[in-house]
């Protein structure tokens, strides 16, 4: 039975040209995390593997910085970056946990962070 929950930064907004940290936390499980994938819709942004470290997809290499921790920092944001982002935790023996973050990139300087929420 999968008992874990993923806490994410929830719905967030940021200014065009700025940067944002995407973070997820897996809790309430003793399962061992072996890999975390970060995806935007159907595109792979980055992988953090317990044994091999980070791999950044070539198409995002100029705009993605690993960290803090298992999080991901997106830089030089454009309005095209608006959308859903997913952190996919591969664990043993539980299996896969997925967290969702919605990012809105704003033209104006009115960028506020939303509340955190949990996904079972």
């Amino acid at each position: 039975m999968m008992t874990g929950t993923i806490e994410t930064t929830g719905n967030i907004s940021a200014e065009k040209g700025g940067s944002i940290i995407l973070q997820c936390h897996l809790s309430s499980t003793t399962a061992q995390v072996t890999q975390v994938n970060w995806e935007q819709q159907d595109q792979l942004l980055a992988i953090c593997n317990a044994d091999l470290g980070w791999h950044i997809s070539p198409s995002f290499k100029d705009r993605v910085a690993p960290g803090p921790g298992l999080g991901l920092t997106l830089q030089s944001l454009t309005v095209n970056d608006t959308g859903e982002y997913f952190c996919i935790y591969h664990t043993y023996p539980d299996g896969t946990y997925t967290g969702r973050i919605f990012l809105e990139v704003l033209e104006s300087s009115v960028a506020e962070h939303g509340a955190r929420f949990q996904i079972p």
């Epitope: 470290g53 980070w54 993605v64 690993p66 803090p68």
Partner: antibody, heavy 117, light 108 residues
């Protein structure tokens, strides 16, 4: 097994700059963040910043943004930190430390910097 | 910045004694990003506990960690001679990463 070898102790005059190195071996240099930490008797351990050698992206502690510059040479698997406009406040032991899966798991032996007036 | 306050600053213990040191954060830190390091005189820090309660590889079982939110603790169930060192808590929940000022464990 990851191993970090730091450059030797430095004695440098006030106002000058210094560049210290941290040579990595035993792992894929471009796949892990490299952090730098300052240690003094008065201030304890202070995080200076980190660099991801895979693309050169850096993050700095605001306190050190105008003081330290982090770079990495992937061909030699070496990370560097340059400290500019040296003062006595910069006298310290500086560690490079590789980010592991979820902690700073590997540390260099430290480089002692002494700034003389 | 998240400020980490460690207590006590110095503690003296006898061999076999149980000791607990604490680390309080100025704002909430997810346990995933709470760590403890041991530093012996003249040496580099060494990871003892990561993710608040997980023992790092090679760390003896008489060490343990626990906590959540704004408080974390490191416990040594039975102090050994080799435990004489300074212990630092550390967070990397957000930038800048910060360390506590350390707890120095001395043997009586």
């Amino acid at each position: 097994q990851a191993y970090l070898q730091q450059s030797g102790a430095e004695l440098v005059r006030s106002g000058a700059s210094v560049k210290m190195s941290c040579k990595a071996s035993g792992y894929t240099f471009t796949s892990y963040n490299m952090h730098w930490v300052k240690q003094t008797p008065g201030q304890g351990l202070e995080w200076i910043g980190k660099i991801f050698p895979g693309n050169g992206f850096t993050d700095y502690n605001q306190k050190f943004r105008d003081k330290a510059t982090l770079t990495a040479d992937t061909s030699s698997s070496t990370a560097y930190m340059q400290i500019s406009s040296l003062t006595s406040e910069d006298s310290a032991v500086y560690f490079c430390t590789r980010e592991g899966w979820l902690s700073l798991g590997y540390w260099g032996q430290g480089t002692t910097l002494t700034v003389s007036s | 910045d998240i400020v980490l306050t460690q207590s006590p600053a110095i503690m003296a213990a006898s061999l076999g004694q149980k000791v607990t040191m604490t680390c309080s954060a100025s704002s909430s830190v997810n346990s995933t990003y709470f760590h403890w390091y041991q530093q012996k005189s003249g040496a580099s820090p060494k990871t003892m506990i990561h993710r608040s309660s997980n023992l790092a590889s090679g760390v003896p079982a008489h060490f343990s960690g626990s906590g959540s939110g704004t408080s974390d603790s490191l416990t040594i169930s039975s102090v050994e001679a080799d435990d004489d060192a300074t212990y630092y808590c550390h967070q990397w929940s957000g930038y800048p990463f910060t360390f506590g000022a350390g707890t120095k464990l001395e043997l009586k």
